[in-house]
């Protein structure tokens, strides 16, 4: 669904940052687009509760009116709300900026469950806590909606960071980072540190939280540990890559790579969840269930619906497998590996049994749309889309959630023959872009 | 078809230690489909769920009993066993045994039930 | 923690009529709920699970609706042996310690 899985999802208080920074690599920092070293004014400039979204502060028109804006990689448009609704603090009155300019033209986007549309427009858009430039840049304004706003979410709208391929109504509708890098000389390059909580937080916690950083032009090398591995961006349009092997504690899952793949692959921070297509996500419960065999759990469990609760500071972490994902290298027949932890695939969640209980929900689910590599992955790392070099770069994350034992991994380089037969090739139809059931 | 039934005794001196113990019949406990559990119920009053444990041995409290509640299995017996220390007659009540089922999340087959008095 | 409250209290009625108990969660509970029937000197038996589903051997009168925070037992037509106490149970936070309080439903 939209909801929870596909868009909103958030996250609240960086983890502990690893005890132990492992020296700088001197891989590809030569070749890094962008300004390289700090970014300071950028760093920590999102925030978030656990399954509701990270969000960004931006300001639109003039005199500024200042909103947050869910940083979705899942999705091309930027679109705010526009009009009074029951779970928006405020939004963009458009007749109250001298620079909104009418594109005379609607937009209306269906998800699975829920939907929003709106009024095309353009206005000024700067992001406060980001690069130092204002832009003038698409905005779907929108005027009714159904399931997409969260009650106590805390943003109003939503920054769509992928390609205008699936922008709406169509691809001619620019989308927000392509206007920046037009009309500026920021490099053409962001990257994401996404805090998970890794504990629950009560109500108080969670809106003080901080929730990690979007970097607009470049890397901050304070934000991750070792070096960065960059797998190609198989196909513009969303930020779609190939997966090459799926392990489980390092046991092979041992299905046809395309499986991994069907019908694509992407990098969503607008998701929850890992997401995995049917098959794959059956033979990695199986394979999950049966590394932590000493315990049962729930059948609901399993499905993200049932709640596993353990005594404050008691969570089992060891009896659970970590999952590693192999994605296609730069080179040929060369991959590296993303390895995640069970503090990233277990959500904490907040405010259900007593204080006394640390509550989760398994964050590994079901998807009729291939894999989506939401938070679940993403909060483990720094990820880099380096869209100039049509390519998505990932470090260990400097704030991932980690216990003494085992910390989350990006490693490499594995020899891996014919990768390019990984990749599914969705049959082309009129209708292929017009799917954005994000369930 | 399965049944369980609890044994132990039915009188209990305060600050002792009550065990009772539950066999499982016309099944085997090592089943992997479900945990095997303890509800208590005070006189006339409603049902307190006490703990449950797995095959393997897993263990999952009530956290206001924690400290004083063992739960034990022997599969080569069918049995699984519960120790409560320093009982106080607050712990007076029907013990019931019971089959935690339906994706081991509710009491889908129950003992009879044995009152256990706490008393000098 | 979850609450589940249970109404009302007691339920008098007569043989043939329709008996309606209510159980409340403090907080969503999705549709992991079960409903038990207990009458004196006897275990507590399953009735109702997932909200929704008759445990087997329950008869076609009992069931069960709700998902969220309200759920609802409806007995369509009381018979003698009806007359019991019932519980509600909550498995959406496992492992499932949560009893309501109970209803008891007595012949008018």
């Known amino acids: 669904t939209h909801l929870g899985i596909r868009l909103p999802l958030r996250s609240g208080l960086a983890g502990p940052p690893l005890g132990l920074r492992l020296p700088r690599e001197t891989d590809e920092e030569s070749e890094e687009p962008g300004r390289r070293g700090s970014f300071v004014e950028m760093v920590d400039n999102l925030r978030g509760k656990s399954g509701q979204g990270y969000y960004v502060e931006m300001t639109v028109g003039s005199p500024p009116q200042t909103l947050n804006i869910l940083v979705d990689t899942g999705s091309s448009n930027f679109a705010v709300g526009a009009a009074p609704h029951p779970f928006l603090h405020r939004y963009y009155q458009r007749q109250l900026s001298s620079t909104y300019r009418d594109l005379r033209k609607g937009v209306y986007v269906p998800y699975t469950q829920g939907k929003w549309e709106g009024e095309l427009g353009t206005d000024l858009v700067s992001i406060p806590h980001g690069p130092n430039v204002t832009v003038r840049a698409n905005i779907a304004a929108i005027t009714e909606s159904d399931k997409f706003f969260i009650n106590g979410s805390n943003w109003e709208g939503i920054l769509g960071l992928a390609y205008a391929e699936i922008a709406r109504p169509d691809d001619s509708l620019e989308p927000f980072f392509d206007s920046l890098v037009k009309q500026t000389h920021i490099p053409n390059i962001f990257s994401l540190q996404l805090c998970g909580a890794g504990f629950p937080l009560n109500q108080t916690e969670a809106l003080a939280s901080v929730g990690g950083s979007m970097i607009i032009g470049g890397i901050d090398h304070s934000l991750y540990t070792g070096r960065l591995w960059y797998t190609p961006i198989r196909r513009e349009w969303y930020y779609e890559v190939i997966i090459v092997r799926v392990e489980i504690n390092g046991q092979d899952l041992k299905m046809d790579c395309k499986e991994y793949n069907y019908d694509k692959s992407i990098v969503d921070s607008g998701t929850t969840n890992l997401r995995l297509p049917k098959k794959v996500f059956e033979a990695a419960v199986k394979s999950i269930k049966a590394a932590s065999s000493t315990e049962k759990f729930p059948d609901g469990f399993w499905l993200g619906e049932q709640l596993v609760c353990w005594q404050a500071g008691t969570t089992p972490w060891n009896i659970f497998p970590v999952i590693s994902l192999y994605l296609m290298g730069e080179v040929t027949n060369q991959s590296f590996r993303i390895t995640i932890l069970p503090q990233q695939y277990l959500r904490p969640v907040e405010d259900v049994a007593t204080s006394q209980d640390d509550c989760y929900k398994f964050a590994v689910s079901q998807s009729s749309t291939g894999t989506v590599m939401g938070a679940v992955i993403m909060e483990g790392f720094y990820v880099v889309f380096d869209r100039a070099r049509k390519r998505i770069g990932f470090a260990v994350s400097a704030c991932h959630v980690h216990d003494e034992f085992r910390t989350a991994a990006v490693e490499g380089p594995f020899v891996t023959a014919d990768m390019e037969d990984c990749g599914y090739n969705i049959p082309q139809t009129d209708e292929s872009t017009l799917m954005t059931g994000r369930a | 078809q399965l049944q369980l039934q609890e044994s132990g005794p039915g009188l209990v001196k305060p600050s002792e230690t009550l065990s009772l113990t539950c066999t499982v019949s016309?099944?085997?406990?090592?089943?992997?489909?479900?945990?095997w559990g303890w509800i208590r119920q005070p006189p006339g009053k409603g049902l307190e769920w006490i703990g449950m444990i797995y095959y393997s041995g897993s263990t999952w409290y009530n956290p206001s009993l924690k400290s004083r509640v063992t739960i034990s299995v022997d599969t080569s017996k069918n049995q699984f066993s519960l120790k409560l220390s320093s009982v106080t007659a607050a712990d007076t009540a029907v013990y019931y045994c019971?089959?935690?089922?339906?994706?081991?999340?509710?009491?889908?087959?129950w003992g009879r039930g044995t009152l256990v008095t706490v008393s000098s | 923690e979850i609450v589940l409250t249970q109404s009302p209290a007691t339920l008098s009625l007569s043989p043939g009529e329709r008996a309606t108990l209510s159980c409340r969660a403090s907080?969503?509970?999705?549709?992991?709920l079960a409903w038990y029937q207990q009458k004196p000197g006897q275990a507590p038996r399953l009735l109702i699970y997932d909200a929704s589903n008759r445990a087997t051997g329950i008869p076609a009168r009992f069931s069960g609706s709700g998902s969220g925070t309200d759920f609802t037992l409806t007995i369509s037509s009381l018979e003698p042996e009806d007359f019991a106490v019932y519980y509600c149970q909550q498995a959406y936070v496992w492992p499932p310690r949560t009893f309501g309080g109970g209803t008891k439903v007595e012949i008018k």
């Open positions: 019971a089959r935690v089922g339906h994706g081991v999340s509710y009491f889908d087959l």
């Open positions: 016309g099944g085997s406990i090592s089943r992997g489909s479900y945990y």
């Open positions: 907080q969503s509970v999705s549709s992991y």
